[in-house]
Interface confidence: low
């Protein structure tokens, strides 16, 4: 009878992460008697994957019923494959011996390659907000993919970006890889509704790339423009002064009215109106009783937006043109905001 040969018909097997790998092995003879073992790698440092005779190998199942006396199929299935399972697997026949079994013959080996999908790209922007015309950096990271070849693209509102740098690590051979990319984006005043998208294409994704997004609303700060105007009201001795706060983002805003440098009232923007571009408008009124003033009044609208240094706009109110009303010591009355007046 011819000497037993251990035949591993597949020189290589390619499996997607999470799936089951089938490693085929057949023997040409039932003699010599003894078990089959599977190893990953060769030499003294090899890793035992399956022992027909003993041991517990929860991820491994056999293709055939190894209890049958005539079995010569020693193929195994390894479940829930991960990139860490990549390597060359050897089917090894042992001769039954005393006290120990003796290695008899090994198959030629089957190289298991694992295709692992990249993780969903995570896009992160700068820690602090920036204003239009500034350039900000966004990073995109994806991990755990194999093989190493991968394509990463950046988009802003569907338009591909070109100013970015990408690295895939590690440079050498590895069971899996990571990609890190940094893109530079110039902000505009219209970017509140904009999105930055990182798109990753990999052989495991079958033409359906993964995308990670960042909303520029988390990154941009559009400072407000201020306009202070004076409007007469019904009573001759009252003047309505309006501070229009336009085109700001985010909403966090505090407004202070000053009369001749003294704080008259402070309020926080609450009910604002939203513009199509995502920025906000807000309006505050101050009702000034000019009869309480002997001299001209300098009214200042001071706005602190999103924790930034205050900006202000002033308006000089001439009191000489208005008749004085005796007995009134109230210089200004609080008004509501958001286009509401309370008298």
């Amino acid at each position: 009878e011819e000497e037993l040969q251990v035949i591993q018909p597949d020189k290589s097997v390619l499996v997607a992460a999470g799936e089951t790998a089938t490693l085929r092995c057949t023997a040409t003879s039932l003699i010599p008697v003894g078990p089959i073992q599977w190893f990953r790698g060769a030499g003294p440092g090899r890793e035992l994957i399956y022992n027909q005779k003993e041991g517990h190998f929860p991820r491994v199942t056999t293709v055939s019923d190894l209890t049958k006396r005539n079995n010569m199929d020693f193929s195994i299935r390894i479940g829930n494959i991960t990139p860490a399972d990549a390597g060359t697997y050897y089917c090894v026949k042992f001769r039954k011996g005393s006290p120990d079994d003796v290695e008899f013959k090994s198959g030629a080996g089957t190289e298991l390659s694992v295709r692992a999908k990249p993780s969903a790209p995570v896009v992160s922007g700068p820690a602090a907000r920036a204003t239009p015309q500034h350039t900000v950096s966004f990073t995109c990271e994806s991990h755990g993919f194999s093989p190493r070849d991968i394509t990463l693209k950046w988009f802003k509102n569907g338009n591909e970006l070109s100013d970015f740098q990408t690295n895939v690590d590690p440079v050498g051979e590895s069971v899996s890889y990571s990609i890190h990319s940094t893109a530079k984006v110039v902000l505009t005043r219209e970017d509140v509704h904009s999105q930055v998208i990182c798109e990753v294409a990999h052989v495991t994704l079958q033409g359906d790339p993964l995308r990670g997004t960042a909303n520029l609303s988390e990154t941009i700060r559009v400072p407000p423009t201020l306009e202070v105007t004076q409007q007469p009201v019904r009573a001759e001795n009252q003047v309505n002064v309006t501070c229009q706060v336009r085109k700001f983002y985010p909403q966090r805003l505090q407004l202070t009215w000053l009369e001749n440098g003294n704080v008259s009232r402070t309020e926080t923007a609450s009910t604002v109106t939203e513009n199509k571009d995502g920025t906000y408008n807000w309006m505050s009124w101050l009702l000034v009783n000019v009869s309480a003033h002997r001299d001209d009044v300098k009214l200042t609208c001071q706005v602190e937006h999103d924790g930034q240094p205050a900006v202000s706009k002033s308006h000089d109110l001439k009191v000489s043109a208005h008749p004085k009303e005796q007995g009134s010591n109230t210089a200004a009355e609080n008004t509501g905001s958001n286009e509401r007046n309370i008298y």
């Epitope: 591993q8 018909p9 597949d10 020189k11 057949t26 293709v63 055939s64």
Partner: antibody, heavy 120, light 105 residues
Framework: AVTLDESGGGLQTPGGGLSLVCKAS????????MAWVRQGPGKGLEYVAE????????YYGSAVQGRATISRDNGQSTVRLQLNNLRAEDTGTYFC?????????????WGHGTEVIVSS | AVTQPASVSANPGETVRITCSGD????YSWHQQKSPGSAPVSVI????DRPSDIPSRFSGSASGSTATLTITGVQAEDEAVYFC???????????FGAGTTLTVL
């Protein structure tokens, strides 16, 4: 490109023997099992014999078992099929195949074939 | 033995599936032959693998003891006889199906 060139066919006498040779090129010959598959006139394909990449293990189809010998020379990149005690039913085109693994389930390349006619 | 249909037909652009059923065969290959006696061409081997020079419209799958050759978007040049090859692990034998004639209408 993988090329498999068969030779040795022709008119053969019943009861006699033939020797077919397949010359391979375009790949690492010693890494692949090689096999012979034949096709009778107006018939389907039939597995004849196979040999492992090292040449140590031959396999034979039931129709030629005991009459055929398959061998290989990895240095010359050739595989040989010797078929004795020829019968009329051995008539057909004999193809040399490259097997990615072993068995017909892994045939990934074919030669152009050589025609064998067994007739008196 | 392995069994495959004697013939199938399809219009250009359609998807064609040819099955091959064995008793206990686990591993299959598919081969295209355009005329009797001419050299077959392997389109699928080891159940699902496709030689590098074969168009991607050819794909293979196997479940249990049945294998399927799928041609997605069949073309006129795909008209041929398709043989499945099977390794029967129960009898340790290599066998071919009788062939399926594909006609592209």
């Amino acid at each position: 490109a993988v090329t498999l060139d068969e030779s040795g066919g022709g008119l053969q006498t019943p009861g006699g023997g033939l020797s077919l040779v397949c010359k391979a090129s375009g790949f690492d010959f010693s890494n692949f099992n090689m096999a012979w598959v034949r096709q009778g006139p107006g018939k389907g394909l039939e597995y004849v014999a196979e040999i492992s990449d090292t040449g140590s293990t031959p396999y034979y189809g039931s129709a030629v078992q005991g009459r055929a010998t398959i061998s290989r020379d990895n240095g010359q990149s050739t595989v040989r099929l010797q078929l004795n005690n020829l019968r009329a039913e051995d008539t057909g085109t004999y193809f040399c195949t490259r097997n990615f693994g072993s068995s017909v389930s892994s045939i990934d390349a074919w030669g152009h074939g050589t025609e064998v006619i067994v007739s008196s | 033995a392995v069994t495959q249909p004697a013939s199938v037909s399809a219009n250009p652009g359609e998807t064609v599936r040819i099955t091959c059923s064995g008793d206990s065969s686990s591993y299959y290959s598919w081969h295209q032959q355009k005329s009797p006696g001419s050299a077959p061409v392997s389109v699928i081997y080891s159940n699902t693998d496709r030689p590098s020079d074969i168009p991607s419209r050819f794909s293979g799958s196997a479940s249990g003891s049945t294998a399927t050759l799928t041609i997605t978007g069949v073309q006129a040049e795909d008209e041929a006889v398709y043989f499945c090859g099977a390794y029967d692990s129960s009898s340790d034998s290599d066998i071919f199906g009788a062939g399926t004639t594909l006609t592209v209408l």
